[in-house]
Structures are given as structure tokens and as C-alpha cells.
């Protein structure tokens, strides 16, 4: 059962796993949610009745019954982890804590103009977990405007104390705001020879990489595969760090793989969600329960529904035994990973999908693309919306993309002459325009946010956000698309599609069925040659065939240029402008979304 409210002046008795320090009860709840075993917590707020050494303590707790006895205690705030909830969870914490000094290892000290600049510095520093900034009112002259970057083993402060005229806060890496490079390369036959900060067991290098990504101190990793010669090290995932933030060297070793934490692009990759099944593989751990199940998929569902289950092993039924049901072993461990992985015993293993909600919804796999043809099928582009105007009569105005449960990203030029958001309707999960009737449900628009530097499509900044009046419930036919990572600027997208209900030729009409076209990206240099009279800036991206024939056209504006990378769809462009439609040597010009990620996050995450 999901309990979100905090219990004031209440302490949970017993069940302690560990104690950390957090600046607020709200953040204690987040820490509990991300901890592999924590189900409940008790936080101690600052209070004259409490010993100051206990202020800001966050005690993480576990219980077989998922609850603990409650005791009244002044200044104690207790609650439950969000593991029990189905809603989206984020580790992003933009709060600034006034007059609090969050203690850690001070590894970097520099002058900063403001707390915001200090936070940005922390976000763009590979080691930084949190910071403390001495304001210009700080008593000690030599410490004023000093920005201290800090890290700890856990990513949370080792202590928090009251200190006048300082502010503290956390790195915004988990808010997708870091400019650090995202090194997605996996290096086969490679060992990184640097300090191990931790080691866990993992079934493959991808799970090892994901564990590294959400481990606060891990910057890169080395994984020993099941063919590794030393039996005791098989399936071992070594989590590593170094002073420089990069491996000091690479050593060639067969059957080892190495790679990097994807911390700076984790919002557009699954990190917590290990959805694969591992055949002929047994995961060892503390046994939670043994239940009968028809299949390994059913076993995974059972694990996902049991809040304390972290992973499972399914042993298929022997012929005609137990009504064809196999045994489903639900398991857990102290760190969420198997304590040992064995091969060749016939089991099928995997992980709970409960943690998938800690990943961005946009990373969820959607149904496979339909190859060939130009008409889409239902659920093929679940982020695509049709934006209608009701004035003077109702009609399709532009396309758009769902990027959050209350946000649509589209083009600014769509709103020429639109006086009020009241005349707009957003329809999601639509394949055919003919489905839209008088009684078809839609989302009203609360606010239109146009980039303040927008003048006309051809001069750039052709981007706008629509804030919806109500939230979108994600389903197979309506879900968000990931924004590209700023750390991914060097990625070459080779699988890009433009979609919309727009014209199929210059003089035409709006199409009934959502159309799709696979279109290659064109370099900005090449694009500039095709548009001598315009300035193709780095904030634009072009796509099209040299010979023409496939392109976006009137009515597609604002819609997505969607590119698939590492099995995840990214909103690379917003259909903006072009010379005619599908003309030879006239590529379509799109708003380059990666250049506006900061702007999008600033507007959508505004408190």
C-alpha cells in the first residue's frame, strides 16, 4: 500500500538498517526509496528538545511485515518509501538549504558569484555530490563567496550542522542538467586498473553498468564475464573511481569488459530497470518466499508485486509435475544484487520491475516499428499528439510530443495568431483524425510558453511548451519520449523518423492517418549549402534525402523528429521549416532539441 504523507512527531521503533544525514524529511524519503532494502524511515528535525548531534538524522528501516510500531517523539518525522507506490519517482533535488552546512570531503574550493553558480559547478564536476556556499554575509571575510564541492561514499552528507549565512544543496546530475560527457562505449577485453569502491555480482556488463550509474561513487566499472578464467571472480562487477574521474590506464584481459557510469545521461536510459531474463542462470540470495508459477514471466510479476523482492530464480516444472507449474524463488540481499550467480543449473533468473518507475517513463520499450509503408499503426509513436484549434472552427493545427505528464513540446510558429490557450485542445493516443469527435476526450492547455528569443521559424528558437490543465496517465498509446542528453552531443543518430498528419505534397490537405517517414540527418555544413539565404545555426538540425521525396510538410510543424539510440527513442528535432516539401537538395530544418534541454528543464521543473 502506498503511503505518501509524512507522520509528524512519530518515530518507527526498530528495523534499523543504517543511518544517513539528510537536510529534510522529504529528502530522507527519497533516500529510503532509492536504498535497496529501506521500506520505512524516521527523520529527526532540528528542535530544542533534541540533542543537536541527532538533528537531520535519517534512519532507514526495513520490516518483514512492511510496517513497524509507532512511538510519539517530538521532532521525529516518519514515513514510508515510495517503493510501495506506482507513481514516477525522481532523485532530482533542486532545493537550497539555508543556514545548513552539509559535511563531506571538501575536495574543491573556489570563488562563486552565487549559490546557483556553485550548484552548477557541482553539477558539472564528476565527483561532486553536494556543496556548501558561504554567502557574502558570511562573518569570515576570507570565506565569503567560497563554493565548497563535496563528496562522500554514500552521496549523502556525513553530518549536517547549523551554520549562519551559508547555503547548501545537491548536484543536479539526477535532474538531467549536467554538461558532463556521456561515455556510452563498452570496452571488450579491457580492465580498468583503478580503486575499487565496491563490488557486486551482475549477470552481464549492462547490468553492471547500470549499477555503476546509480551508485553515488562509481565513475567507471570492470565486469568479469562468466567465461573469466578465475572462477571466484566470474560475474563480478567492480565499481571504480579515480582522482581524475577517468581510468588511469586500460589493461587488456580476455573475457572482461569495462565501461563508464552514465550518470550524466541517466534520464534517457534505463538505470534501475533490469528487464532481461537470464537463462540457465541461478541468482543466490536470502530467500523471501517460494511460490508456484506457470512461467518465468509470471515469476517476475510475483517478484515485482512483492515489495521486498529484489530478484528471483525460476526453476521450470518437471514434466506433468505440479500442474505444469515451476518453482519461483523470490529473493533479496543487502545491496539488491545476487550474492552469487551460478550457471548450468537450468534456472531462469531476473530482477523485480518495481524499480522501473525510478527510471524516466520515456525509456520504456514500445512495440517494434512497422517496417515499410508510410501509414503508422496504433501505439507506434505514443508521444505524438495532435494539437487542435477550435477557432474559428475545430481543425488540426500542429503536431507535438509528450515529454512529461503535463508537458507537450512543439514549435513556436504554431501559435501565430493564437490569442489564448483556451482555444487549444491536445489529443493524445490518436492514429486517425477521424477518431476525433465531439465527445473525444482531450487535454486543455493551461499555458503556452514560447521561447522569448523566437521571432520567426527561419531565424531559430522555434520551440514552445504547452502546460496541460490535467496530467496524462501513461499507457501503451500515450507516453513520453526522452529528451536527448547534453552529454550525448557527439552521438550520430542513424534511425530517425518524422511523423505527422501534415500534407503529403505542397498543395494537399491534412491526412487522416498519422504518416511516418524514415529520414537521414544531414550535417549543418551540408544544410547551409542548401540554404544560402539563411543562417543554419547549431540550434537547428537538418534531415532529408538529397534526391528529396520524403520530408515533413505543412501540418507536421511542431511534431517530432524521433531517433532511436541504444533501444531508446529520443526527441532530436521539432519540425520547423523548409523550402517547399520534399524538394531535391532542400532538407527539412528542425529545432535542435539538445540545445534547448536547459530551457525545457528550467520551464518544466520550475517550482
Amino acid at each position: 500500500e502506498c503511503v505518501t504523507q509524512l507522520l509528524k512527531d512519530t518515530c518507527f521503533e526498530g528495523g534499523d538498517i543504517t543511518t544517513v544525514f539528510t537536510p529534510s524529511a522529504k529528502y530522507c524519503q527519497v533516500v529510503c526509496t532509492y536504498h535497496p532494502r529501506c521500506l520505512l524511515f524516521t527523520f529527526t528535525a532540528e528542535s530544542p528538545s533534541e540533542d543537536p548531534t541527532r538533528w537531520f538524522t535519517c534512519v532507514l528501516k526495513d520490516s518483514v511485515t512492511e510496517t513497524l510500531p509507532r512511538v510519539n517523539r517530538t521532532a521525529a518525522i516518519s514515513g514510508y518509501s515510495f517503493k510501495q507506490c506506482s507513481h514516477q519517482i525522481s532523485a532530482c533535488n533542486k532545493d537550497i538549504y539555508v543556514d545548513l552546512d552539509m559535511k563531506g570531503i571538501n575536495y574543491n574550493s573556489s570563488v562563486a558569484k552565487s549559490a546557483q553558480e556553485c550548484q552548477e559547478r557541482c553539477t558539472d564536476d564528476v565527483h561532486c555530490h553536494f556543496f556548501t556556499y558561504a554567502t557574502r554575509q558570511f562573518p569570515s571575510l576570507e570565506h565569503r563567496n567560497i563554493c565548497l564541492l563535496k563528496h562522500t561514499q554514500t552521496g549523502t552528507p556525513t553530518r549536517i550542522t547549523k551554520l549562519d549565512k551559508v547555503v547548501s544543496g545537491f548536484s543536479l546530475k539526477s535532474c538531467a542538467l549536467s554538461n558532463l560527457a556521456c561515455i556510452r562505449d563498452i570496452f571488450p577485453n579491457t580492465v580498468f586498473a583503478d580503486s575499487n569502491i565496491d563490488s557486486v555480482m551482475a549477470p552481464d556488463a549492462f547490468v553492471c553498468g547500470r549499477i555503476c550509474t546509480h551508485h553515488p561513487g562509481c565513475l567507471f566499472f570492470t565486469f568479469f564475464s562468466q567465461e573469466w578464467p578465475k572462477e571466484s571472480q566470474r560475474n563480478l562487477c567492480l565499481l571504480k573511481t579515480s582522482e581524475s574521474g577517468l581510468p588511469s590506464t586500460r589493461i587488456k584481459k580476455s573475457k572482461a569488459l569495462s565501461g563508464f557510469s552514465l550518470q550524466s545521461c541517466r534520464h534517457s536510459i534505463p538505470v534501475f530497470c533490469h528487464s532481461s531474463f537470464y537463462h540457465d542462470t541461478d541468482f543466490l540470495g536470502e530467500e523471501l518466499d517460494i511460490v508456484a508459477a506457470k512461467s518465468h514471466e509470471a515469476c517476475q510479476k510475483l517478484c515485482t508485486n512483492a515489495v521486498r523482492c529484489q530478484f528471483f530464480t525460476y526453476t521450470p516444472a518437471q514434466a506433468s509435475c505440479n500442474e505444469g507449474k515451476g518453482k519461483c524463488y523470490l529473493k533479496l540481499s543487502s545491496n539488491g544484487s545476487p550474492t552469487k550467480i551460478l550457471h548450468g543449473r537450468g534456472g531462469i533468473s531476473g530482477y523485480t520491475l518495481r524499480l522501473c518507475k525510478m527510471d524516466n517513463e520515456c525509456t520504456t520499450k514500445i512495440k517494434p516499428r512497422i517496417v515499410g509503408g508510410t501509414a503508422s499503426v496504433r501505439g507506434e509513436w505514443p508521444w505524438q499528439v495532435t494539437l487542435h484549434t477550435t477557432s474559428p472552427t475545430q481543425r488540426h493545427l500542429c503536431g507535438g510530443s509528450i515529454i512529461g505528464n503535463q508537458w507537450i513540446l512543439t514549435a513556436a510558429h504554431c501559435f501565430y495568431g493564437v490569442e489564448s490557450p483556451k482555444i487549444l485542445r491536445v489529443y493524445s493516443g490518436i492514429l486517425n483524425q477521424s477518431e476525433i469527435k465531439e465527445d473525444t476526450s482531450f487535454f486543455g492547455v493551461q499555458e503556452i510558453i514560447i521561447h522569448d528569443q523566437y521571432k520567426m521559424a527561419e531565424s531559430g528558437y522555434d520551440i514552445a511548451l504547452l502546460k496541460l490543465e490535467t496530467t496524462v496517465n501513461y499507457t501503451d498509446s500515450q507516453r513520453p519520449i526522452c529528451l536527448p542528453s547534453k552529454g550525448d552531443r557527439n552521438v550520430i543518430y542513424t534511425d530517425c523518423w518524422v511523423t505527422g498528419w501534415g500534407y503529403r505534397k505542397l498543395r494537399d490537405k491534412i491526412q487522416n492517418t498519422l504518416q511516418k517517414a524514415k529520414i537521414p540527418l544531414v550535417t549543418n555544413e551540408e544544410c547551409q549549402k542548401r540554404y544560402r539565404g539563411h543562417k543554419i545555426t547549431h540550434k537547428m538540425i537538418c534531415a532529408g534525402y538529397r534526391e528529396g521525396g520524403k520530408d515533413a510538410c505543412k501540418g507536421d510543424s511542431g511534431g517530432p523528429l524521433s531517433c532511436k539510440h541504444n533501444e531508446v527513442w529520443h526527441l532530436v528535432g521539432i519540425t520547423s521549416w523548409g523550402e517547399g516539401c520534399a524538394q531535391r537538395e532542400r532538407p527539412g530544418v528542425y529545432t535542435n532539441v539538445v540545445e534547448y534541454v536547459d530551457w525545457i528543464l528550467e520551464k518544466t521543473q520550475a517550482v
Epitope: 556521456c182 561515455i183 581510468p247 563508464f260 552521438v491
Partner: antibody, heavy 118, light 107 residues
């Protein structure tokens, strides 16, 4: 067919700068780690620098660390080497090469000569 | 850092001969060694990797052996186009290091 074409070499004074380019074709450039290897006149081969496919991690020989910068533009299929504070001992033919999973330099360009002299 | 030493620095042989070039690493490098051929005025060409694996397209008269610190490149039945300079390269760890080269000349 894999092709690597270096350019940008020439005569430069000690302390000067030069930028080498390597245009790649015939393979998926963004999937490959790339490197620069040099050869001083009449001498052996010396590895200079490497860069991973994403461009996010670079490695350098001690002899060039802090002076040379390797980079790549995957959209242009081009590898670069920015050489600053050049010294007479940097005089060499500079080759661009692909670095394979075998930990060998699979394909090489024809090289470009850099001469550092006053 | 690992250093590589090749011997001899030059060798003379005739067409049809069998030639052996050796390479020694300053520390054990398992079988992580590559061999290259460089003809005058040309770029090097990868012949062998992992001490004994032949790169595709390389004639079978080239063979490699060894592990740990001592390695050999053998060329059977020398052909005119085989007269060139040969380099070994340790592929164990960064920084990558080459041997100083062995020049194979026509006797």
C-alpha cells in the same frame, strides 16, 4: 573500402601550433576508437594519442600530454589533433589509425609530415 | 610503462629464406602482442595480433608465437614484397609501445 586521409601538416616554428585532420570513409566512423601514431624521420613508430568512439575519453603519451589535444566530429567523420607548443622533437610523419578490439591499429592513413624548425 | 626491444635491428636474407624476428617485453604481457610491416614510404600494416592470430588478408607464410615476455615473428619462404621494416607492439596496456623495428633487407 576503409580510407583515412590526413591533412594539415607543414612547417612550423618551435612554440607554434598546428591542427591535423583525418577524414574517414568506408566504415562507420562513430563506432571506432581512433588514434594518432607518429614516426620521426628514419626512426620507429610512437603512439601519440587515442580517443574513444563517443569522444568522451582521450589518452595521451607522456611526451605530448598537456600540449596535444585529440578530438573527433562524428557528424563529419573526422579526427583531429591540435598540436600546441611544438618542439623540434615533434617533427615526424603523423598517421591516423583505427584501433580495433584486437588492440591493434587495423587501418592507417598515408600520413602527413609535420616539420618543427626555426 | 612497458618497453619493447626487438632483435636484430636488421637482418639480410634471400628470396625463399625463412626469417625469425624476436621481440622482448620489459614485463609479462600475456599474449597481447601485435606485429606490423612497413614498406619504405608507406604506412604500417597490421600482420598479427594476440601474438599468433593472423589479420585477415595476410599470407599464411607469416606466423607469430610466444607469450609472457618473449615473442617471435617468422616469415617462411620470403617473397620480394616482404623486404620491409617490421615492428612489434605491446597490446597489454596503455601507453601503447612499439619496438624500435627490424629492417629486413635483400642479401
Amino acid at each position: 573500402e576503409v580510407q583515412l586521409l590526413e591533412s594539415g601538416g607543414g612547417l612550423v616554428q618551435p612554440g607554434g601550433s598546428l591542427r591535423l585532420s583525418c577524414a574517414a570513409s568506408g566504415f562507420t566512423f562513430s563506432d571506432y576508437e581512433m588514434a594518432w601514431v607518429r614516426q620521426a624521420p628514419g626512426k620507429g613508430l610512437e603512439w601519440v594519442s587515442s580517443i574513444v568512439p563517443s569522444g568522451g575519453w582521450t589518452l595521451y603519451a607522456d611526451s605530448v600530454k598537456g600540449r596535444f589535444t585529440i578530438s573527433r566530429d562524428n557528424s563529419k567523420n573526422t579526427l583531429y589533433l591540435q598540436m600546441n607548443s611544438l618542439r623540434a622533437e615533434d617533427t615526424a610523419v603523423y598517421y591516423c589509425a583505427t584501433w580495433g578490439d584486437s588492440w591493434g591499429f587495423d587501418f592507417w592513413g598515408q600520413g602527413t609530415l609535420v616539420t618543427v624548425s626555426s | 610503462d612497458i618497453q619493447m626491444t626487438q632483435s636484430p635491428s636488421s637482418v639480410s636474407a634471400s628470396v625463399g629464406d625463412r626469417v625469425t624476428i624476436t621481440c622482448r617485453a620489459s614485463q609479462g604481457i600475456s599474449s597481447w602482442l601485435a606485429w606490423y610491416q612497413q614498406r619504405p614510404g608507406k604506412a604500417p600494416k597490421l600482420l598479427i595480433y594476440d601474438a599468433s592470430s593472423l589479420q585477415s588478408g595476410v599470407p599464411s607464410r607469416f606466423s607469430g608465437s610466444g607469450s609472457g615476455t618473449d615473442f617471435t615473428l617468422t616469415i617462411n619462404s620470403l617473397q620480394p614484397e616482404n623486404f620491409a621494416t617490421y615492428y612489434c607492439q605491446q597490446a597489454d596496456s596503455f601507453p601503447i609501445a612499439f619496438g624500435q623495428g627490424t629492417r629486413l633487407e635483400i642479401k
